[in-house]
């Protein structure tokens, strides 16, 4: 988790002088509770936005937006702590909005936004906005939390972000798989414009089961430059097992930008359709 390396971060708006500061995620008001604390944020919304760094790289960011409740507690609102928690790693990053002037009621509801938390493709987050100071122990909570799921690199807008392109999102192998005679599969795919090796992982399954009945790995050496964007054809021999008829072919590239962690593409061959009742073979061929 990190912040976008983006100009000075601002949170000021007409009628409010405000500065954005790094935070340890442990505001001083936890240690020194105050008697009067503000109410919780209202209508917290998290959206996927995209932003460029100063170097021109494009990253997915969490766009956080919330409003204030229209009660007198805004007189005691000194700022807000914004926290993004990556749910599986438990990694947390926080920033603090520090209000340098007192808030006053005005004709519009106060609205705040922040769009500088960089998020990773295909990851899950919890976003929390805490109004400051935080409540006394056993006081009413004055925060709001929402979960946020970032789409993977298959998503159209994500595909062109720097992290996705680094993992090979622009490569479309256009995999085709055909069943040949003598228990063989022909796999064909388009090579990318990089001299790197590939691996074909074949996993076969019985018709209606998810436990594999055959696994095979095939190594494809790095292509020469004149082979870039060309089709690579590989014939794989299957194990002659009755009913082991559903095949999943996965192609793993080893691009220099992502090494062992590149996006994999797969294609599946279903078992041949079995007729419900076998049709009888006639003894003679009718002429009509």
């Amino acid at each position: 988790l990190r912040l976008l390396d983006h100009r000075a971060l601002v949170c000021s708006q007409p009628g409010l002088n405000c500065t954005v500061k790094n935070s340890t995620c442990l505001d001083d008001s936890w240690i020194h509770p105050r008697n009067l604390t503000p109410s919780s944020p209202k209508d917290l919304q998290i959206q996927l936005h995209f932003a460029h760094t100063q170097q021109g790289d494009l990253f997915p960011v969490a766009h956080i937006e919330w409003t204030l409740q229209t009660d007198a507690s805004i007189l005691y609102l000194e700022g807000a702590e914004l926290s993004v928690l990556q749910l599986n790693t438990n990694e947390r990053l926080c920033v603090r909005f520090e209000f340098l002037s007192k808030l006053r009621h005005h004709h519009r509801r106060w609205r705040f936004t922040f769009s500088h938390f960089v998020v990773d493709p295909d990851q899950e987050y919890e976003v929390t906005v805490h109004h400051l100071p935080k409540p006394i122990p056993d006081g009413d909570p004055n925060h709001q939390s929402k979960n946020f799921l970032v789409p993977d690199c298959e998503h159209a807008r994500m595909k062109v972000t720097t992290p996705c392109m680094s993992s090979g999102s622009l490569w479309d192998p256009n995999i085709t798989v055909e069943t040949l005679e003598a228990h063989q599969l022909r796999v064909s795919f388009t090579l990318w414009n990089e001299s790197t090796h590939y691996q074909i992982l074949l996993t076969s399954f019985p018709h209606m089961e998810n436990h594999s009945c055959f696994e095979h790995m095939h190594h494809i050496p790095a292509p020469r430059p004149e082979e870039f964007h060309q089709r690579s054809n590989v014939t794989l021999t299957l194990r002659n097992l009755k009913g082991c008829c559903r095949h999943q072919v996965q192609i793993q590239p080893f691009f220099s930008s992502c090494l062992n962690d590149c996006l994999r593409h797969s294609a599946t061959v279903s078992c041949p359709e079995m007729p419900d009742t076998p049709e009888p073979i006639p003894d003679y061929m009718p002429l009509w």
Partner: antibody
Amino acid sequence: QVQLVQSGAEVKKPGASVKVSCKASGYSFTRYGISWVRQAPGQGLEWMGWISTYSGNTNYAKQFKGRVTMTTDTSTSTAYMELRSLRSDDTAVYYCARRVLRLDYWGQGTLVTVSS
Amino acid sequence: EIVMTQSPATLSVSPGERATLSCRASQDISISLGWFQQKPGQAPRPLIYGWNTRATGVPARFSGSGSGTDFTLTISSLQSEDFAVYYCQQYSDPFLTFGGGTKVEIK
């Protein structure tokens, strides 16, 4: 091929505990959390909570807090869900699922029957 | 917690017809919604999530729409294998919740 394989059916007496296992394969175990969902006979799906396979951090549904413990063993890519002080209304199929929010792969389910 | 309400409880449709299933959240969940299909004796199967994205291997006849509090799962032309129970699930709130399910049965 991502797979979650759960332990077999269990029959327990009221007041006892049950521990269901969920062995993951086909992906990097610590990349995604594991969620647990249960389904009583003829009923809908009920979320129980999740565990971070990376940090061990947990988030339990309110109605299970104090009775449930979710753990993982990263060396065997296995997640566990232990439910204590079993009651007859805990009779259900217990599912593990990959991830915390988008439950994209599910185990086959483990039937836990609580009966005296 | 966010309460998810599905309607109707049962939907009778003929094969080849269009099926429209509804899911309503008790508060705004933006697009943080998933749909699952479950057949008797099987685990739920993910269909659609978030940005109306179909899960791996889900046919194009399944589509999701809606945001905020009202969501719809549409099956454009029902096939025999589509008769099942369908659940929606919100993941906006830290405590996930499922709808009660809609059973799609043969008319």
